[in-house]
Interface confidence: medium
């Protein structure tokens, strides 16, 4: 808590400018009007304040807005955002995507902090669902964002938002998450032609059921081994040798390199040796 002291004569701030960097903490507290600070927040980031000075500015805003900052202030917080606690952020009502982008930019290149997680949570809850623009923004800043959501949270993602998802956004998703995302992707891409559909759906196939894999095997898709290895074991097991051969196409040779790993290992054990022999790869059931 900064002690209340009178502002020295002639030091009352008329605007937020670089002269304030020479103010001691108590002078900032005494000489900067909170309302002036709120209206000129966009200037704060251009001024090289110390962390201690930023603490004072935050304190002034907290006094002015005890119920939480208005969005006009939040949008221009800049580096002052890093001083906010999750408790501070829970008081906010952030509705503008521009505000979200501005604050994510401040944290760019760092792991998702508790502050950022709280901000995103407040924003998404305020919108009611993860729309395409929001998902676009969040995955641009945090490629792993989608996979950080629970299956329950993912269920609120509308199929239209799936268009924003890039393959790398799904790298850390587990099978339960892909189980939720795959039907949405299937719906989102349903009107695409065969080859384009496969390119888009490929990253989501870890949630595909057996019948969809069987259907893909009839379409000459040449699935690569990395994608095949991410398929659900229970979805792969019922596939016949002929179906796997058609599904993988030229990549079928890769089964030999992966024969000790799931789901290939488990699938091999389910096949008749005579059928495996037809692959010509020397796989042993």
């Amino acid at each position: 808590e900064v002690e209340k002291t009178a502002c020295p004569s002639g030091k009352k701030a008329r605007e937020i400018d670089e002269s304030l960097i020479f103010y001691k903490k108590w002078e900032l507290e005494a000489c900067v009007d909170a309302a002036l600070l709120a209206t000129q927040m966009d200037r704060v980031n251009a001024i090289p304040f110390t962390y201690e000075q930023l603490d004072v500015l935050k304190h002034k805003l907290d006094e002015l807005y005890p119920q939480g900052y208005p969005e006009s202030v939040i949008q221009h917080l800049g580096y002052l955002f890093l001083k906010m606690s999750p408790e501070d952020i829970r008081k906010w009502n952030v509705t503008s995507l521009e505000t979200l982008k501005a604050l994510l930019e401040v944290n760019k290149g760092h792991e998702m902090s508790p502050q950022v997680a709280t901000l995103i949570d407040r924003f998404v809850k305020g919108r009611g669902q993860l729309d395409k623009d929001t998902l676009d923004t969040l995955t641009a800043f945090y490629p792993g964002y989608l996979c950080s959501l629970s299956p329950e949270e993912l269920s609120s993602v509308p199929p239209s938002s799936i268009w924003a998802v890039r393959p790398q956004d799904l790298d850390t998703c587990d099978p339960r998450q892909l189980d939720v995302l795959y039907p949405k992707a299937r719906l989102a891409f349903q009107n695409m032609n065969g080859s384009e559909y496969f390119v888009k759906i490929q990253s989501f196939l870890g949630g595909a059921p057996t019948e969809d894999l069987k259907a893909l095997s009839q379409q000459n898709v040449s699935m690569d081994l990395a994608t095949f290895m991410k398929l659900r074991t229970d979805a792969v097991l019922p596939l016949t040798v002929a179906e796997v051969q058609k599904l993988l196409g030229p990549h079928v040779e890769g089964l030999k390199a992966e024969e000790r790993h799931r789901p290939v290992r488990d699938w091999i054990l389910r096949q008749r040796q005579d059928d495996l022999d037809t692959l010509g790869l020397g796989l042993q059931g």
Partner: antibody, heavy 115, light 110 residues
Framework: EVQLVESGGGLVQPGGSLRLSCAAS????????MHWVRQAPGKGLEWVAY????????YYADSVKGRFTISADTSKNTAYLQMNSLRAEDTAVYYC????????WGQGTLVTVSS | DIQMTQSPSSLSASVGDRVTITCRAS??????VAWYQQKPGKAPKLLIY???SLYSGVPSRFSGSRSGTDFTLTISSLQPEDFATYYC????????????FGQGTKVEIK
């Protein structure tokens, strides 16, 4: 020991034809894919064509589609590349390579297309 | 068609240096990515397949990794015999099977 030996390269005029051979030993090409990859003088690698005899798969790079044909004679354990309508830009060392990750390569054979 | 953009095109390094070469795919790409070493007048040699699997007989100082559409070859401690040209290569999945090579990176002695 796995070995691949290319032959059939040489000097040919634009519009002419040439057939390259890739004799394999140490494995059965019937059960493996075979690729042709070329390298123009001082340039990088360019994939040309692929065959997987067991499944009768053949694939080609757009730059050679309709002019080159890849084939295999499994009784001779040899893959071939029939090159027709040759152009100056086809001048390169042609390598054959084996398998899923191109794990074995031949020493290469030089094809020069010039008048 | 998918392009594999390899960088840098050349680099100078000393024995013992850590060297990193990157290939960026122009679009969503499978992990069927391999790395090769080629010395003048010789055929390429396989180093890494499936993005990160070390080929048998290849020294453990070579490693491969993937992050999204970026694929990286790392030589942890450069040896005299490692001065060569390195290529990345991708085998596409999808309807049109094709193989694409990066432009190559020449690793020279500083």
């Amino acid at each position: 020991e796995v070995q691949l030996v290319e032959s059939g390269g040489g000097l040919v005029q634009p519009g002419g034809s040439l057939r390259l051979s890739c004799a394999a030993s140490g494995f059965n090409i019937y059960y493996s894919s075979m690729h042709w990859v070329r390298q123009a003088p001082g340039k990088g690698l360019e994939w040309v064509a692929y065959i997987y005899p067991y499944y009768s798969y053949t694939y080609y790079a757009d730059s050679v589609k309709g002019r080159f044909t890849i084939s295999a004679d499994t009784s001779k354990n040899t893959a071939y590349l029939q090159m027709n309508s040759l152009r100056a830009e086809d001048t390169a060392v042609y390598y054959c390579a084996r398998g899923y990750a191109l794990d074995y390569w031949g020493q290469g054979t030089l094809v020069t297309v010039s008048s | 068609d998918i392009q594999m953009t390899q960088s840098p095109s050349s680099l100078s390094a000393s024995v013992g240096d850590r060297v990193t070469i990157t290939c960026r795919a122009s679009q969503s790409v499978s992990s069927a990515v391999a790395w090769y070493q080629q010395k003048p007048g010789k055929a390429p040699k396989l180093l890494i397949y499936s993005a990160s699997s070390l080929y048998s007989g290849v020294p453990s100082r070579f490693s491969g990794s993937r992050s999204g559409t970026d694929f990286t070859l790392t030589i942890s401690s450069l040896q005299p015999e490692d001065f060569a040209t390195y290529y990345c290569q991708q085998a596409s999945s999808g309807y049109h099977y094709l193989i694409t090579f990066g432009q190559g990176t020449k690793v020279e002695i500083k």
